[in-house]
């Protein structure tokens, strides 16, 4: 970006920029991040008791050690490790559920079904969902103004990087037959670009997962298309078969009767396609 | 060590009624659950929410949500509001604690002996 | 939506005997044992016979056996008394916080 370029250039030291240079395109960090942290993960190990050894002052501590006093565009996943080790938790194998583009359908699933996981069910993944931060180079301030911006600034920061690495992980540790959710309403169901196509995809681990089940997610209460032919997830399919992963791909019709049917299973109506 | 409910009641459809559980030789330690469950007469068991002592953070059966309020008033009582009651909330309604300590966690381990409300007109 | 199912119910025995009472869960429980079984007579709370699938609570006599993983779990009462006649309970912790109970299993001693 603009800024790496003079920085780059000229180089000089990020300090010695005058403090108007640290305005980025993102949003600041939310307000009273360090309070939301550290009463997530109160409330995280209360509720998941294998976690309950957690100590979550050293979980914050760990959290802030990843970006303060760093400059916010040369974040690297290194900077994350302490507080990886510190989160360090499994999922059954088989109940490890990814997601591309479609998260509240996804959480809303694993709301109701207790035993499947998304990210955001981890403690880290929980820590963080819809959480922005960032700090200041040689300083030990939180940015609440604003911080980089993926596309704007640059891809090294605190954010971004944070959910690459838990990512990274997540898609490391899971076994069996994983499931992915995908969005059928966008023009490239699989992106290649996305978290999942750039990183989850990539880390799934062929000895020990047998499978990736993908579900297509339709839009339309009309769409009555099979979705799973689609280029994009064909182009998945391809890449998880040359890693020697088997893949299925499901097609969901209808959403609002799919989470229905996961709470009220018995239903008459469940026993017809969703 | 014992639990004991009070505030049960004969009321009317539509009424609320708070029902308090009060703890005996102990007080809630920081990570004790304290919880509620009903028993219909001649039915099952049924759990209806949780507070934790040392947070006041709550857990509800998804039923219970909006009609039961379950709070912590001291270091030894937590209550149960119920509002517009009807007659399917005629229950024994139990006051049960998850110590969480060790490896109990995830069941309740001390019950009161039950508290009686009765919905009618 | 977690739904614990017992059976049978009721189940006759006699003194002596063996009795075995099922549970099956909708979901897995968490960490795949966190279920407990109560026994309750009438006009008493519960009382808590076995916690983590198998482990005996304090003062249950060894005759009661807790089994089972994930979905599936059992509990075996041998050398059944009439002391035993009484309601069976599952009850399971799930994730966020959820506890649930299952139906019951009437036991009747013969």
């Known amino acids: 970006s603009g800024l790496n370029d003079i920085f780059e250039a000229q180089k000089i030291e990020w300090h010695e920029l005058p403090r108007w240079r640290q305005q980025w395109s993102g949003s600041g960090t939310t307000s009273r991040f360090p309070e939301t942290v550290l009463a997530r993960c109160v409330k995280y190990t209360e509720v998941h008791p294998e976690m309950r050894h957690v100590d979550c002052q050293s979980v914050w501590d760990a959290f802030k050690g990843a970006f303060i006093s760093k400059y916010p565009c040369n974040i690297t996943e290194e900077d994350y490790q302490p507080l990886v080790k510190l989160g360090t938790q499994t999922v059954p194998c088989n109940k490890t559920l990814l997601w591309s583009r479609i998260k509240d359908l996804a959480h809303q699933f694993t709301q109701v079904q207790r035993d499947m996981f998304t990210l955001e069910d981890m403690l880290l993944g929980y820590l963080a969902d819809d959480l922005t931060w960032c700090g200041e180079f040689n300083t030990f301030e939180i940015n609440y103004q604003s911080c980089p911006d993926w596309r704007k600034d640059c891809s090294n920061n605190p954010v971004s990087v944070f959910w690459k690495t838990v990512s990274r992980r997540f898609a490391e540790t899971a076994c069996g037959v994983v499931h992915v959710m995908l969005n059928g309403s966008r023009s490239k169901i699989f992106d290649k670009n996305s978290t999942f196509g750039s990183v989850e995809v990539h880390n799934l681990q062929p000895e020990k997962v047998q499978a990736l089940e993908a579900w297509v997610i339709h839009g339309g209460r009309e769409d009555s298309r099979d979705l799973c032919q689609d280029p994009t997830i064909k182009e998945l399919e391809s890449i998880i078969s040359k890693r020697n992963i088997r893949f299925f791909c499901k097609n969901i019709y209808r959403p609002d009767k799919f989470l229905q049917c996961v709470k009220n299973p018995e239903d008459s109506s469940c026993l017809s396609g969703i | 060590q014992s639990l004991e409910e009070s505030g049960g009641d004969l009321v009317k459809p539509g009424a609320s009624l708070t029902l308090t559980c009060t703890a005996s030789?102990?007080?809630?330690?920081?990570?004790?659950?304290i919880c509620w469950v009903r028993q219909a007469p001649g039915k099952g068991l049924e759990w209806i929410a949780c507070?934790?002592?040392?947070?006041?953070?709550t857990y509800y059966a998804s039923w219970a949500k909006g009609r039961f309020t379950i709070s912590k008033t001291s270091s030894t009582t937590v209550t149960l509001q119920m509002t517009s009651l009807t007659a399917a909330d005629t229950a024994t309604y139990f006051c049960?604690?998850?110590?969480?300590?060790?490896?109990?966690?995830?069941?309740?381990?001390?019950w009161g002996p039950g508290t009686l409300v009765t919905v009618s007109s | 939506a977690q739904v614990l199912t017992q059976t049978p119910s009721p189940v006759s025995a006699a003194v002596g005997g063996t009795v075995t009472i099922n549970c099956q869960a909708s979901q897995s429980v968490y960490n795949n044992n966190y279920l407990a079984w109560f026994q309750q007579k009438p006009g008493q709370p519960p009382k808590l016979l076995i916690y983590?699938?198998?482990t005996l609570a304090s003062g249950v006599p060894s005759r009661f056996k807790g089994s089972g993983s994930g979905t599936q779990f059992t509990l075996t009462i041998s050398e059944v008394q009439s002391d035993d006649a009484a309601t069976y309970y599952c009850q399971a912790y799930y994730s966020g916080g959820i506890y649930a109970f299952g139906g019951g299993t009437e036991v009747v001693v013969k």
């Open positions: 049960a604690g998850d110590p969480r300590t060790g490896s109990n966690v995830g069941y309740f381990n001390l």
């Open positions: 507070i934790v002592a040392g947070t006041t953070n």
């Open positions: 030789g102990f007080s809630f330690s920081s990570r004790y659950w």
């Open positions: 983590s699938a198998s």
